[in-house]
């Protein structure tokens, strides 16, 4: 059998050793082929090895599993189900592994899984039951606390004939399994909108990252129930203005810090409330960096330096006076 590591180093398992014992039941502390293992750190790294499936012979002690930079393509149901189960596995990183399908129950039988990173995978098919494991209306609670789903949008030509936002949200809400989720990262996914019911059903969220999407408006999104929310990242979206209802909801959250940099703010008469709010609120981080993008005459003006006289709307001309 391959050696397990000392306290200070990782051991690598030679491929020929692994194949020599593959017909036998895996030894408890064996290190899979193409992986590095440290029992002291309870960590297994199978990184940038072009693996096409999850190793079957993961050591039972694994607490942190890195399977990044591989070519997994599909994560089937029970992809990590083992006998005995991987009862200690708490952090699983699958980023950049060319996953395009995650099936129902892919993460079942991982009772301690708290952190899951699926970032940088073109997920054309994310099952609604990927995280809940069953299609029951109320599933057993997932142990997940952190779910990292940055840049999981597939290329346009690979998307199914359905809303990508809808597919992701269905997986987040299925069976109410993620009620304990505290961190959710959804950056860089070309989201055009946020379905209105998603936040209401994730009441434990502390950190929500929606940066680098294409969100135009938050009018139909409610933050009111997110009483534990500490950080809300909305940088690098397509937001034009925040309206009174949203301002009041954000202002009322007891722990909140909001990040709004690099949005194309439209500085016309509809911006007056937001400017008034910005001048007094302490919840927006780096508010002195926010600038107008439109109209052209206002480009690069700092929002905090605007007054009501600057924020006008062109009168709507009656049809008889409009030119074609």
């Amino acid at each position: 059998s391959s050696p397990t590591s000392s306290a200070s180093s990782f051991s690598s398992s030679a491929p020929f050793l692994a194949s020599a014992v593959s017909a036998q039941p895996p030894l408890p502390d064996q290190c899979p082929a193409l992986c590095e293992c440290s029992e002291a750190a309870r960590t297994v790294k199978c990184v940038n090895r072009n693996l096409t499936e999850v190793p079957t012979d993961l050591p039972a002690y694994v607490r942190n599993l890195f399977l990044t930079g591989n070519q997994l393509a599909v994560l089937p149901a029970g992809a990590f189900a083992r006998r005995p189960p991987l009862a200690e596995l708490a952090a699983l990183n699958l980023s950049g592994s060319r996953l395009d399908e995650v099936r129902a129950g892919a993460f079942e039988h991982l009772p301690s899984l708290r952190q899951l990173d699926l970032s940088h995978n073109p997920l054309a098919d994310l099952s609604p039951f990927a995280f809940s494991g069953s299609n029951a209306s109320v599933s057993a609670p997932s142990p997940l606390v952190e779910l990292i789903l940055n840049h999981i949008v597939p290329p346009e030509d690979e998307r199914q004939n359905r809303s990508f936002e809808g597919m992701v949200v269905a997986a987040l809400l299925a069976g109410r399994a993620l009620q304990g989720l505290r961190r959710l990262e959804l950056a860089s996914n070309h989201f055009l909108y946020l379905p209105r019911d998603v936040l209401a059903q994730l009441p434990s969220l502390r950190h929500l990252d929606l940066s680098n999407n294409s969100l135009v408006s938050l009018t139909y999104v409610s933050f009111r129930n997110l009483t534990h929310l500490e950080s809300l990242h909305l940088e690098d979206n397509a937001l034009k203005v925040l309206h009174n209802g949203t301002l009041a909801e954000l202002q009322g959250l007891p722990h909140i810090r909001v990040f709004l940099d690099n949005n194309p703010w439209v500085c016309d008469c509809h911006m007056a409330d937001m400017v008034t709010w910005l001048k007094e609120t302490e919840v927006v981080q780096g508010k002195d960096r926010l600038t107008c993008a439109y109209p052209e005459k206002m480009r690069n003006r700092v929002l905090l330096e605007l007054n009501s006289a600057d924020l006008d709307c062109d009168p709507i001309l009656p049809p008889s006076l409009q030119t074609s």
Epitope: A248, Q251, H255, R257, F259, E280, E282, Q285
Partner: antibody, heavy 122, light 111 residues
């Protein structure tokens, strides 16, 4: 567990200077506004000022009664808040508390230290 | 500056009875739908302890006999059934505007 521990108080003559420290632990120091509040013996509470967090540039606000004499600063590498007090007067005699603002600073202070006594007397 | 006036200055209440403390602000402490008014409890030789934030939200770990109400300029702290350990001075504080200001305090004693 959030902990705030003040130090640096003592007896000082009018016109003198003193620097109070507040060592913070149990939270991400740079994320939070921090403040000083004082309480003269047997009297009520008076807000001295605050220093903003990293996201808002560590800028400060002070009460009118100490403006130009007291300076709030922070050493984020040491998770320590300071109050530099110059031109001290008898009316500055008080217990000085360091306090952490809630994540949304509009909701004011949720954790306080035990305080350090400053006595200004000749 | 916003001035907070607390009443009464002191209050004697029998154990198990209701205690009510008022705080009036010289101008509204409301901002975008939330009243930024807090209540603190202070016992001798101890720092203030946060009880209520945003006028009516009870801080985690605070017994549910404490409640806060009010909006705009008029606020109330209620102790529904006074216990011996509630003997303390209570302060209101506004954080709507800089400088933050405190009320003068109300001393609660046992009758």
């Amino acid at each position: 567990e959030v902990q705030l521990v003040e130090s640096g108080g003592g007896l000082i003559q009018p016109g003198g200077s003193l620097r109070l420290s507040c060592a913070a632990s149990g939270f991400t120091f740079t994320d939070y506004y921090m403040s000083w509040v004082r309480q003269p013996p047997g009297k009520g509470l008076e807000w001295v000022g605050f220093i903003r967090n990293k996201g808002n540039g560590y800028t400060t606000e002070n009460s009118a009664s100490v403006k130009g004499r007291f300076t709030i600063s922070r050493d984020n590498s040491k998770s320590t808040l300071y109050l530099q007090m110059n031109s001290l007067r008898a009316e500055d005699t008080a217990v000085y508390y360091c306090a952490r603002y809630r994540g949304n600073p509009h909701y004011a202070m949720d954790y306080w230290g035990q305080g350090t006594l400053v006595t200004v007397s000749s | 500056d916003i001035v907070l006036t607390q009443s009464p200055d002191s209050l004697a209440v029998s154990l198990g009875e209701r205690a009510t403390i008022n705080c009036r602000a010289s101008e509204s402490v409301e901002f975008y739908g939330t009243s930024f008014l807090q209540w603190y409890q202070q016992k001798p030789g101890q720092p203030p302890k946060l009880l209520i934030y945003g006028a009516s939200n009870v801080e985690s770990g605070v017994p549910d006999r404490f409640s806060g109400s009010g909006s705009g300029t008029d606020f109330t702290l209620t102790i529904s059934s006074l216990q011996a350990e509630d003997i303390a001075v209570y302060f209101c504080q506004q954080s709507r505007k800089v400088p933050s200001t405190f009320g003068g305090g109300t001393k609660v004693e046992i009758k």
